[in-house]
């Protein structure tokens, strides 16, 4: 079954197609469905979920996070500049999330699957924004590096990487979700 | 206090137009993706109309499409519904509604309505 | 009008315990957790009880519950008072980018 996809969409293909917004919210919970599994494998195999030095961690990452200045939170709420954020958020995402990439055992395929998920949800969302500014790309050249930065840490930070990323991601899925309930 | 303030309805003819307005205060109107809901005389409540936070997105039950337009002035904190081809089906009370924040499609609040009534 | 049903008029004693159903399909109420619950009381607007199937709206009493199962939601009043006597109305978000309300139940608390 496709992400986003009832089973028994696909089986009755002559049933509604799901809506611009019915996609995005399904493609989103899809991928938080998926961040849970990963998080689940991370957490059993490490006691990062409980550890208490993830500041050290952090400050190697610039994860994307929502701030006031987005207009993503329900004071100063702003629809244009939201949706701005939310695509552009995604696609800083990709390099981490390609990190994460050989970084599960049991769990490889869905860590694929957020990623591959991710990917058609931008799409979506970019469709949604298309009559809006231009959204910059990451730069090619600064991802790969970052990623090879990555991969170069001991074990520890590695684990601590991909606990933080999920957890971020996680965080960032969750407000978009509640501002496209306004869009 | 978060309040929705209706005012616009009245007596209309058949194929008649009439523009209802709902004036909000209490709280930030351009954060809220707001609706309009009627409620035919002895009847159950009709969603007509949604509009997002910022404008860009409109939704319409089928049946006002193409007669009824719903906009918005964030400006000025106000939520409009251009009804015309007004039909008698169309008689009820007109509630101004706000979505709740973050969630998909439920009403946290409700103004006190302003009636239609489409007579000849 | 495009309705999900609801039966016309439900009554309990006060203390008791009362269920009104709604019943729509996998368009509807059977598609995600989109259902939510109105009090009306007479000559009033509605009132937001229960949003998301089982969220009880801010202020709301935890007398009142929600649940659902497949293509039917239900709305639960326990411990009936005076007060409740009104007009209860499901919502859920219907395919296609719409609402869609019940037809309404009239709760008569007796005696």
């Known amino acids: 079954v496709p992400p986003g996809e009832d089973s028994k969409d696909v089986a009755a293909p002559h049933r509604q197609p799901l809506t611009s917004s019915e996609r995005i919210d399904k493609q989103i919970r899809y991928i938080l469905d998926g961040i849970s599994a990963l998080r689940k494998e991370t957490c059993n195999k490490s006691n990062m979920c409980e550890s208490s030095k993830e500041a050290l961690a952090e400050n190697n990452l610039n994860l994307p996070k929502m701030a006031e200045k987005d207009g993503c939170f329900q004071s100063g709420f702003n629809e244009e500049t939201c949706l701005v954020k939310i695509i552009t958020g995604l696609l800083e995402f990709e390099v981490y999330l390609e990190y994460l990439q050989n970084r599960f055992e049991s769990s490889e395929e869905q860590a694929r699957a957020v990623q591959m998920s991710t990917k058609v949800l931008i799409q979506f969302l970019q469709k949604k924004a298309k009559n809006l500014d231009a959204i910059t790309t990451p730069d090619p050249t600064t991802n790969a590096s970052l990623l090879t930065k990555l991969q170069a840490q001991n074990q520890w930070l590695q684990d601590m990487t991909t606990h933080l990323i999920l957890r971020s991601f996680k965080e960032f899925l969750q407000s978009s979700l509640r501002a496209l309930r306004q869009m | 206090e978060v309040q929705l303030v209706e005012s616009g309805g009245g007596l209309v003819q058949p194929g008649g137009s009439l523009r209802l307005s709902c004036a909000a205060s209490g709280f930030t109107f351009s954060s809220y993706a707001m609706s309009w809901v009627r409620q035919a005389p002895g009847k159950g409540l009709e969603w007509v109309s949604r509009i997002s936070s910022g404008g860009i997105s409109t939704y319409y039950a089928d049946s006002v499409k193409g007669r009824f337009t719903i906009s918005r002035d964030n400006a000025k904190n106000t939520l409009y519904l251009q009804m015309n081809s007004l039909k008698p089906e169309d008689t009820a009370v007109y509630y101004c509604?706000?979505?709740?924040?973050?969630?998909?499609?439920?009403?946290?609040?409700w103004g006190q309505g302003t009636q239609v009534t489409v007579s000849s | 009008q495009s309705v999900l049903t609801q039966p016309p008029s439900v009554s309990g004693s006060p203390g008791k315990t009362v269920t009104i159903s709604c019943a729509g399909t996998?368009?509807?109420?059977?598609?995600?957790?989109?259902v939510s619950w109105y009090q009306q009381l007479p000559g009033m607007a509605p009132k937001l009880l229960i949003y998301d199937v089982n969220k009880r709206a801010s202020g709301i009493a935890d007398r009142f519950s929600g649940s659902k199962f497949a293509n039917t939601a239900s709305l639960t009043i326990s411990g009936l008072q005076s007060e409740d006597e009104a007009d209860y109305y499901c919502a859920s978000y219907k395919r296609g980018d719409n609402a869609v309300f019940g037809g309404g139940t009239k709760l008569t608390v007796l005696g």
């Open positions: 509604v706000r979505y709740a924040w973050g969630v998909q499609w439920a009403f946290d609040f």
């Open positions: 996998s368009s509807d109420v059977g598609y995600g957790n989109y």
